[in-house]
Amino acid sequence: EVEKTACPSGKKAREIDESLIFYKKWELEACVDAALLATQMDRVNAIPFTYEQLDVLKHKLDELYPQGYPESVIQHLGYLFLKMSPEDIRKWNVTSLETLKALLEVNKGHEMSPQVATLIDRFVKGRGQLDKDTLDTLTAFYPGYLCSLSPEELSSVPPSSIWAVRPQDLDTCDPRQLDVLYPKARLAFQNMNGSEYFVKIQSFLGGAPTEDLKALSQQNVSMDLATFMKLRTDAVLPLTVAEVQKLLGPHVEGLKAEERHRPVRDWILRQRQDDLDTLGLGLQGGIPNGYLVLDLSMQEALS
């Protein structure tokens, strides 16, 4: 808190300019009019203030706008944004994507701060949903943004926005998140032809059910092992050896290296050993020949 002192003679700021960098903190407090600062916020970021000085300017804006800054000021905060607390940001009403971009630019190249997280939350809630332009912007600045959302929050993403998602945006998503995103992606890409469809849907397949994997196996997609290993175990288990062979195409040889890892390990345990032998990969652990396989889940469903 800067103590109130009279502005020295001749030091009253008539405009926000570089001469102010030579003002002591108390002089900034005494000699800069808050209303002038608010109308000339666009100049502040170009002036090499210290953060101590920016703290004083923030204090002046806080006094002028105790209920929260108007967007005309927020848009031009620049590095002053770094001095804002999440509590400050919760008072804002940010509606312009340009404002959001300007503030994200300040934090570019760094992990998402609590301030940025609060800003994004306020912005998205204000819009009511994660539209394509917003998602485009957020994933450009924070590739992991989508995977930071809860399944409930992801449910507000319209299928049209899925076009903005790049494979790397889904790297840290867990199965629960992919369960929500996959049906949206399926809807978004439904009018594409086979090979183009697979390229787009591939990153979302961690949320795909068995029937969709069976359908893909009929389309010569040649799924790579990295994608296969991210599939839901419960979706992979019912696939036959022939279906997996068709799904993976030439990549089927990679199963041997993954035979001890899920979902491959669990899938092997469900297959007849003689079926596995047809692959010629030396996969072991299947059901020995002559054993009867009872599908207890089916039996329970019928009773």
């Epitope: 090499p48 210290t50 953060y51 590095y79 770094l82 760094h110």
Partner: nanobody, 116 residues
Framework: QVQLVESGGGVVQPGGSLRLSCATS????????MGWFRQAPGKGLELVAR???????MYADSVKGRFTISRDNSKNTVYLQMNSLRAEDTAVYYC??????????WGQGTQVTVSS
């Protein structure tokens, strides 16, 4: 974190000269270049001179024409050449910069005393 170390302070007579150095322990990523600040006894910290990332220099009115700020990137060092020193230049001199994350950094300071 990069360390800032000032040197070159001392006692000098009015009209004399001193050259202050500020060495950084590594490359700094500064939002506002490097500044020389001073704090006289019982007074607030004030900026004396600043050299921006593009080499632009800026001076407080009280030192214009007497002080010169410069830098040697190969040595990670910023200098303040102080000529025609006056009694009112007596202070602890600090170098400092602001990063891109909301923090100001300062050295430990070097004392300059102008006295006859």
């Amino acid at each position: 974190q990069v360390q800032l170390v000032e040197s070159g302070g001392g006692v000098v007579q009015p009209g004399g000269s001193l050259r202050l150095s500020c060495a950084t322990s590594g490359t700094i990523f500064s939002r506002n270049g490097m500044g020389w600040f001073r704090q006289a006894p019982g007074k607030g910290l004030e900026l004396v001179a600043r050299i921006l990332n593009d080499g632009t220099t800026m001076y407080a009115d009280s030192v214009k024409g007497r002080f010169t700020i410069s830098r040697d990137n190969s040595k990670n060092t910023v200098y303040l050449q102080m000529n025609s020193l006056r009694a009112e230049d007596t202070a602890v001199y600090y170098c400092g910069y602001s990063d891109y994350r909301g923090t100001d950094y300062w050295g430990q300071g070097t004392q300059v005393t102008v006295s006859s």
